[in-house]
């Protein structure tokens, strides 16, 4: 293959890969024919001039993991050809001017994951040709205006995980073609108005991990086109009015783990594709009427680990297509009757780990479809006649950690629950709290005679009183519906930034797994 | 005869993090719920968390990112662990749980304590 | 999260005049439909654990004497000691759980 350098392989397809600590230098003599060079996980500490000079050919050159900390500023000579560099997971801490040159068909550049202290507008002013930028995983404290202005045709521009404490609104003035831009894990804590008024085709923003306590009203104005936006884990206190209002496009906005106190009423401007609403983990002590009416192709609504303790009757309104409903670990003591009234199509909801005491009788009327319903950990003494009785595709109940009173009153839902037994799962069963005779006996099981009798007349129940058997075919399938939504928050699709973590009961849905944004 | 013994407690450095057992007995973990309080010396009794029959959780939210509170039915053993100390963390450590009373938060069997010092 | 304060800090009564201890809430605790105030008394001698005395504002828990009575409702709530014993002389606590629990700072009472 024109001349295979030992520690390197070649393939018939013009691609060379060096790799081992055993090279310190880059291998030659490289193939004439090259295209594509890889030099991964070497002891290379420095890149002397232009000792790529006889593969002209070369369209990818990466040069990754190794402990390569300077760069003479000739070294990609001769590259012309070249679409794709990658300099990332080195030990770089300064980048030479003019290192970039010459490289008129570079349309790919990662710098990303070495200590880059700073960039400068001569950087990459000869790079008019570059689409994507990575600079994530640096040490860069600012950008200077100009640094990008050369990059008309920047598609994407990754500038995550660095320590920026303030963006220049200039600096990104002249990125029309911008498509992405991360500035995720920064510490940035404010935006300047107009920051992203010239990126008018981006699709993506990613803003999560900062320090960020105010957004400018119109901060997105301009950015009509935008599909994701994330915001989470910020110190975001209150959102302008407009601060939503021109976001048609948005299908993903991510809100949690920000110290929103409060939502109101049409903050969420209209968002036709709007699928997942991400909210858990703020403040917020109330939701008002209509406050996600313009929702309509709402999914899933998280608003677990908050501390609303108010929900208003018409707070769901417009929600016809939502699916999943998070309220726990909340401090809801009630509930109005028609508060789920809107959400027909509605399969999950969590209201586990609240403080609810009662329940009205008509709180499930109109949501027929409800697969799962999480009551446990509440201060449920008892539930109303046939509160569930309608729910015919309901398969997963939870209603232990609850102080049922199993006096006479509980007869009704006792029965109920003989009969739907595996709607109950088998790990924990509701237990009786009072009378203290016979705390700590399984509900379903109890022998309500035992119980000190109620003081009020029962109501003529309408649960089914029938006993349950084994063997009868009636029951519902025991199959669990808490779908994969329930399990995990929100992953930014983003390779770059996906970091899943373990948490114990205290995660967002209460189960397993959360994505910490 | 209702029983708790708590266990665990002693010097720890700060920054470091504590283990706390509270052995039950004469009734079953899996009937009652078991809280945590904590009262420094000369100070106020301080509600920690709680972790009740079915295994749910609930904590003091100005502590929640530092504790867990865990059980194990079969060893009618409860426990708490409590990360990242602090001189402040220094107090005596109840576990308590409501045996008859009808309050569901209430606490009517307590035990003696365990004594946690925070100090390098 | 409620915050309870009680009154006053420390108290010194004669034996067998009454004692008046107030507990104030940050909030109401009372839940209008079960009609309750979720709030509880505490009782706590020296170098011993603390002893749960009335529960629901007003309900005495069982075994303890009649002497103990808790009043109040909403956010203002009072634990009267009728005729003070020796034995009363102790620390107590108010305690919320409308929310998750609270306790007040507490109030020492002692033998004039």
């Known amino acids: 293959y024109h001349g295979c350098p030992s520690e390197c392989t070649c393939s018939r397809a013009s691609q060379v890969e060096c790799t081992g600590a055993r090279i310190v230098a880059v291998p030659t003599p490289l193939p004439w024919n090259a295209m594509s060079l890889q030099i991964l996980n070497t002891h290379i500490t420095e890149l002397n001039e232009s000792p790529f000079l006889n593969i002209s050919a070369l369209i990818a050159l990466r040069i990754e993991k190794n402990e390569l900390s300077r760069i003479t500023p000739g070294a990609f000579r001769n590259l012309g050809s070249l679409r794709y560099l990658s300099l990332a997971n080195n030990k770089l801490q300064v980048l030479p001017i003019g290192l970039f040159q010459g490289l008129d068909s570079l349309e790919s550049l990662l710098l990303s994951s070495n200590q880059l202290l700073q960039i400068q507008p001569a950087h990459f002013s000869q790079c008019s040709n570059l689409k994507e930028l990575q600079l994530h995983g640096n040490h860069l404290e600012y950008i200077p205006d100009g640094a990008f202005d050369h990059l008309v045709g920047l598609t994407k521009l990754n500038l995550g995980k660095n320590s920026l404490t303030h963006i220049s609104p200039r600096v990104f003035q002249h990125l029309g073609n911008l498509q992405v831009l991360r500035l995720y894990e920064n510490r940035l804590t404010d935006i300047p108005m107009g920051t992203f008024d010239g990126l008018v085709n981006l699709q993506e923003l990613a803003l999560q991990q900062n320090q960020i306590g105010l957004l400018s009203p119109g901060l997105f104005h301009n950015n009509h086109n935008l599909q994701r936006l994330y915001l989470s884990n910020n110190h975001i206190s209150q959102l302008p009015p407009s601060v939503f209002m021109q976001l048609p496009q948005l299908n993903r906005l991510t809100l949690f783990g920000n110290s929103l106190k409060e939502l109101s009423p049409g903050i969420f401007g209209p968002m036709p594709n709007l699928r997942e609403l991400w909210l858990y983990d703020n403040h917020i002590s109330s939701l008002p009427d209509n406050v996600f009416s313009n929702l309509r192709q709402l999914q899933v609504l998280i608003l677990s680990r908050n501390q609303i303790s108010f929900i208003s009757p018409g707070a769901f309104n417009g929600l016809t297509e939502l699916r999943e409903l998070s309220l726990h670990t909340n401090a809801l003591q009630d509930l109005d009757g028609n508060v789920f009234r809107m959400l027909a199509n509605l399969q999950n909801i969590s209201l586990q780990n609240n403080r609810l005491r009662q329940l009205p009788g008509n709180i499930f009327a109109n949501v027929n479809g409800l697969m799962a319903i999480q009551l446990q950990n509440n201060q449920l003494e008892n539930l109303p006649l046939g509160i569930f009785d309608h729910l015919g595709k309901l398969c997963e109940l939870r209603l232990y950690d609850n102080p049922w009173r199993c006096d006479s009153d509980i007869l009704p839902l006792r029965n109920w629950l003989l009969l739907n037994q595996p709607r109950l799962g088998t790990d924990t069963v509701p237990v009786c709290f009072s009378p203290a005779n016979v705390r700590g006996q399984s509900l379903i099981i109890i022998n309500v005679n035992v119980a000190v009798p109620s003081v009020h007349v029962p109501e003529v129940p309408s649960y089914p009183e029938t006993p349950w058997y084994p063997d009868t075919p009636s029951y519902p399938d025991t199959t669990s519906v808490s779908s994969t939504t329930e399990l995990t928050s929100p992953v930014e699709d983003y390779t770059d930034l996906t970091t899943i973590q373990v948490t114990d009961d205290r995660s967002v849905w209460g189960m397993t797994q959360a994505q910490s944004g | 005869e209702v029983q708790l013994v708590e266990s665990g407690g002693g010097l720890v450095q700060p920054g470091g993090s504590l283990r706390l057992s509270c052995a039950v007995s004469g009734f079953s973990l899996t009937s009652y719920g078991v809280h945590w309080v904590r009262q420094a010396t000369g100070k106020g009794l301080e509600w920690l968390g709680v972790i009740w029959a079915g295994g749910s959780t609930n904590y003091n939210s100005a502590l929640m990112s530092r504790l867990t509170i865990s059980k194990e039915n079969a060893k009618s053993s409860v426990y708490l662990q409590m990360n990242s100390l602090r001189a402040g963390d220094t107090a005596m450590y109840y576990c308590?749980?409501?045996?008859?009373?009808?309050?569901?938060?209430?606490?009517?069997?307590w035990g003696q304590g365990t004594t946690v010092t925070v100090s390098s | 999260d409620i915050v309870m304060t009680q009154s006053p800090d420390s108290l010194a009564v004669s034996l067998g005049e009454r004692a008046t201890i107030n507990c104030k809430s940050s909030?109401?605790?009372?839940?209008?439909?079960?009609?309750?105030?979720?709030l509880a008394w505490y009782q706590q001698k020296p170098g011993q654990s603390p002893k749960l005395l009335i529960y629901w504002a007003s309900t005495r828990e069982s075994g303890v004497p009649d002497r103990f009575s808790g009043s109040g409702s909403g956010t203002d709530f009072t634990l009267t000691i009728s005729s003070l014993q020796a034995e009363d002389v102790a620390v107590y606590y108010c305690k919320q759980s409308y929310n998750l629990p609270t306790f007040g700072g507490g109030t020492k009472v002692e033998i004039k």
């Open positions: 308590a749980t409501h045996m008859h009373t009808e309050d569901y938060y209430g606490m009517d069997y």
């Open positions: 909030q109401s605790l009372l839940n209008s439909r079960t009609r309750k105030n979720y």
